[in-house]
């Protein structure tokens, strides 16, 4: 999805993108708070399709893991974050009910500011 | 999904999420980069379920659509920019070909920077 | 013999509503997706907008999306095109045709309704 | 997208010569193309797709030839009712015309 390094920009956080198959995720959080089991696979009309996300997160060993580049540091302490965001999802909850739930899955990676006090 | 604010956290870019039925969406961009038709409900074993998306971009009318918050301006332009992620959705292409689809829909709003040159 | 028989057209001002109908016969009008096709005054074709056999997928071109709706009534062989906030450009002899089979081509027209937007 | 581009824009020629009409593609569209005739005051008439197939009821005089980028309709022996506009189309992604070439007479 157009990479700012293209465009001669740089990211205030560092990110990564992977694709996560099911079999690796195995439970994750539904909209409701609960964890619920993420099947393998779906039932589409002609067999089954594999349950994959495409996931982004900030970047542990990014240069921006002590906090968010470019930001006035006289004012603000900062801190790059992993955000989340809801993808359907073919899910087992604990009741063994199987049906397609909203989950959380981590897709960006943002800045955080808090003010600086006592200067 | 864990609001920043309620810690006395900002976010470097201010940012909206809607959920947004296919009916509203109509068109997406697939992984190939052709467009698509996103169908409106998804056959279930049970009837049909409609098709939504939860949709995050940068606040258009938000503090930091003229760049973004906290940012060292002595030596960075800035600007918050509205980034996709892929997330399956049942389409039809132009081939009146129905199929599960990787889709592209913006998942979030993050800041890019250029160096500020000739100071 | 195929015909399609379009109506509806007329003049309106700029963001007004118009309601364009094609009425079929001599086929079999719930085995074939439909399509509206428009054509500027002295100007080529443009396809709008078309919607599948059994009426439950729609699609449309980038130019109207969000403001025109393609719909078909199976029992009364006649297909429909709301059209919303309706702008100067969207002028044009309006054409009802039938798709083929398996692609997005035309093999019957009607002979069209005017639609002129004009303050 | 996609763009079809139609060359000439005009072709004035006598009736029983030859036409050649032209449409470029913007990038490969395979054979997914149609052409169509226009007359004044009508609707289009389908006359081939795939490029080179012809329609149901549309004479043997007119042929569509080409792949990929570049396509050409010919009509061998133009009779009077041949002059007309006549329009490509590719289905190879979401429907797009070119912008025309008409055969006129001379």
């Known amino acids: 999805h157009s990479d700012p390094a293209r465009r001669g920009e740089l990211s205030v956080c560092d990110s990564i993108s992977e694709w996560v198959t099911a079999a690796d995720k195995k439970t994750a959080v539904d909209m409701s708070g609960g964890t619920v089991t993420v099947l393998e696979k779906v039932p589409v009309s002609k067999g089954q399709l594999k349950q994959y996300f495409y996931e982004t997160k900030c970047n542990p060993m990014g240069y921006t893991k002590e906090g968010c580049r470019g930001i006035d540091k006289r004012h603000w302490n900062s801190q790059c974050r992993t955000t989340q965001s809801y993808v359907r999802a073919l899910t087992m909850d604990s009741k063994k009910r199987i049906g397609w739930r909203f989950i959380r899955i981590d897709t960006s990676c943002v800045c955080t500011l808090t003010i600086k006090r006592g200067r | 999904h864990s609001d920043p604010a309620r810690r006395g956290e900002l976010s470097v870019c201010d940012s909206i999420s809607e959920w947004v039925t296919a009916a509203d969406k109509k068109t997406a961009v697939d992984m190939s980069g052709g467009t698509v038709t996103v169908l409106e409900k998804v056959p279930v074993s049970k009837g049909q379920l409609k098709q939504y998306f939860y949709e995050t971009k940068c606040n258009p009318m938000g503090y930091t659509k003229e760049g973004c918050r906290g940012i060292d301006k002595r030596h960075w332009n800035s600007q918050c920019r509205t980034t996709q992620s892929y997330v399956r959705a049942l389409t039809m292409d132009s081939k009146k070909r129905i199929g599960w689809r990787f889709i592209r829909i913006d998942t979030s709003c993050v800041c890019t920077l250029t160096i500020k040159r000739g100071r | 013999d195929v015909q399609l028989v379009e109506s509806g057209g007329g003049v309106v001002r700029p963001g007004e509503s118009l309601r364009l109908s094609c009425a079929a016969s001599g086929f079999t009008f719930d085995n074939y997706d439909m399509s509206w096709v428009r054509q500027a005054p002295g100007e080529g074709l443009e396809w709008v907008s078309g919607i599948r056999e059994s009426g439950d997928i729609t699609y449309y071109a980038d130019s109207v999306k969000g403001r025109f709706t393609i719909s078909r009534d199976n029992s009364k062989n006649t297909l429909h095109l709301q059209m919303n906030s309706l702008r100067a450009e969207d002028t044009a002899i309006y054409y009802c045709?039938?798709?083929?089979?398996?692609?997005?081509?035309?093999?019957?027209w009607g002979l069209g309704t005017l639609v002129t937007v004009s303050s | 997208e996609i763009v079809l581009t139609q060359s000439p824009g005009t072709l004035s020629l006598s009736p029983g010569e030859r036409a050649i009409l032209n449409c470029r593609a913007s990038q490969n569209i395979d054979s997914d193309l149609a052409w169509y005739q226009q007359k004044p005051g009508q609707a289009p008439r389908l006359l081939i797709y795939?490029?080179?197939t012809r329609a149901a009821g549309i004479p043997a005089r007119f042929r569509g030839s080409g792949s990929g980028t570049d396509f050409t309709l010919t009509i061998s022996r133009l009779e009077p009712e041949d002059f007309a506009v006549y329009y490509c189309?590719?289905?190879?992604?979401?429907?797009?015309f070119g912008g025309g070439t008409k055969v006129e007479i001379k």
């Open positions: 045709a039938r798709e083929t089979r398996k692609a997005i081509l035309f093999d019957y």
């Open positions: 795939g490029a080179n």
């Open positions: 189309q590719q289905y190879y992604d979401w429907p797009r």
